[in-house]
């Protein structure tokens, strides 16, 4: 499948140019930045859609601890190398030359260097910890019905199998969903957990990713779920390598 | 409450098309993906795709790819599936059945829709 | 694709007794301690029924005397006191890797 063929758009990609050049006349889009085709019957890549976002204009208890090998985006956005299939490079660099080694969702995993610096591997993200905290609602929402409505909306809206989705825990006002996925767990046509948080995570601040959608309107039983903080943390198959100087 | 309800049972001859409807009612129609399952006469249940009602698509067994078409119509929150090239074998009731909540359990049904194909 | 073994394939039992019905998986079906596991009922000329769901859930509405348990590759559905409403065909379905796939089902059957 690829782009909407009655109008001509990318369900899944607002930053996209789209026209019917594809093969018989079918209706192919390309995304912003990087004019790379897209696949709109799913969610186009975190570092494709980070590209497209510097290319745009400007104004457009029961709870999990991270582990110290957690990874928190401190370091925001920036314009990424993506490979051919839309991933991150393992190495970024900026305009300045100041190099620094990412993971399978963008995040750096190292010390910045210069352009000596090597990173042999793109290091697979294969846990994620998406920590929100809810406004205050007449009551606690139920937990199973929490956990079954951010299953669903993950299932529907970010095309992420339940199995993905190893865990929902709750402490009012606190939710924390887990997200794992081994490389030998992933498999051809399966969404990557790093693009099904990333397109939650823009819905959540209001900054929907999807064309011509509503934003986010989350519910459990009916009762609006209104995020008022969220911080994700990144659980690499390898730990990351940064200095003791950075922990300090 | 939650309602599926299908199409009225159809006779068609093999290498013929037979297309299946199943109507939602009681919920949100495009908060939840819709699955076909087949059941020969005497036989067991077969799963034959699901399709997201939310964008669209569909995933289908690749024992009838090729053969089987899922579509669905917003406006009027129903469910479609057409299969091709019939053959005695297709006989069978046909089941639309709605994604549970969070494990993809199949939580309602409808009441099935018999196709026979016969010469 | 995932392959289901359901034993037995048919049973007769009496009213009151405890019923078991198995299913083995050619492949764990558990992540990370969610078993995609399903069990469902279907009387005659009617729809299959969800009973339990995610292994050893039970479906809202039903009676508990249906439970399920185990995880990874084999699975039980027990009725714990059997009632003569429960002749029907019972089928497991695991929902963990497309294609979903059914057991071949256990017909139930009162003595």
């Known amino acids: 499948h690829t782009a909407a063929q009655d109008n001509c758009t990318c369900p899944t990609n607002k930053m996209t140019v789209c026209s019917p050049d594809g093969p018989g006349g079918r209706c192919q889009c390309r995304a912003l930045g990087s004019g790379m085709a897209v696949d709109c019957s799913t969610l186009t890549s975190k570092c494709l859609l980070l590209k497209a976002r510097m290319s745009a204009p400007k104004n457009a208890r029961t709870l999990v601890r991270p582990s110290e090998h957690a990874l928190v985006d401190n370091d925001g956005l920036y314009d990424p190398d993506c490979d051919p299939e839309g991933r991150f490079k393992a190495r970024q660099c900026n305009q300045t030359s100041v190099c620094w080694c990412v993971n399978s969702v963008g995040v750096r995993r190292t010390d910045k260097g210069d352009l000596s610096l090597r990173c042999d591997e793109l290091v697979r993200t294969h846990h994620i910890l998406i920590d929100l905290r809810h406004r205050p609602t007449a009551g606690a929402f139920n937990h199973s019905d929490l956990d079954a409505e951010l299953r669903r909306l993950f299932r529907e809206r970010y095309r992420l199998h339940p199995k993905f989705v190893a865990a929902v825990h709750y402490e009012q006002p606190t939710i924390q969903i887990e997200l794992r996925q081994n490389t030998s767990q992933k498999a051809a046509g399966d969404v990557d957990i790093g693009d099904a948080a990333y397109y939650f995570e823009r819905d959540i601040k209001g900054e929907s990713l999807f064309q011509g959608r509503g934003g986010l309107d989350l519910r459990v039983r009916g009762e609006p779920l209104q995020v008022e903080r969220t911080l994700i943390y990144y659980l690499d198959e390898i730990p990351p390598k940064f200095s003791m100087k950075r922990l300090t | 409450q939650v309602q599926l309800v299908q199409s009225g049972a159809e006779v068609k001859k093999p290498g013929a098309s037979v297309k299946v409807s199943c109507k939602a009612s009681g919920y949100t129609f495009t908060d939840y993906s819709i699955n076909w399952v087949r059941q020969a006469p005497g036989q067991g249940l077969e799963w034959m795709g699901v399709i997201s009602t939310y964008y669209g698509d569909a995933s289908y067994n690749q024992k009838f790819k090729g053969r089987v078409t899922m579509t669905r119509d917003t406006s009027t929150s129903t469910v479609y599936m057409e299969l091709s090239s019939l053959r005695s074998e297709d006989t069978a009731v046909y089941y639309c059945?709605?994604?549970?909540?969070?494990?993809?359990?199949?939580?309602?049904w409808g009441q099935g829709t018999l196709v026979t194909v016969s010469s | 694709d995932i392959q289901m073994t359901q034993s037995p394939s048919s049973l007769s039992a009496s009213v009151g007794d405890r019923v078991t019905i198995t299913c083995r998986v050619s492949?764990?079906?558990?992540?990370?301690?969610?078993?995609?596991m399903h069990w469902y009922q279907q009387k005659p000329g009617k729809a299959p029924k969800l009973l339990i769901y995610r292994a050893s859930n039970l479906e809202s509405g039903v009676p508990s005397r249906f439970s399920g348990s185990g995880s990874g590759t084999d699975f039980t559905f027990t009725i714990s006191s059997l009632q003569p409403e429960d002749i029907a065909t019972y089928y497991c379905q695991q929902s963990y890797e497309d294609p979903y796939t059914f057991g071949g089902g256990t017909k139930l059957e009162i003595k």
């Open positions: 059945a709605r994604y549970g909540d969070g494990y993809n359990q199949f939580d309602y």
């Open positions: 492949e764990s079906v558990d992540s990370y301690g969610n078993n995609f």
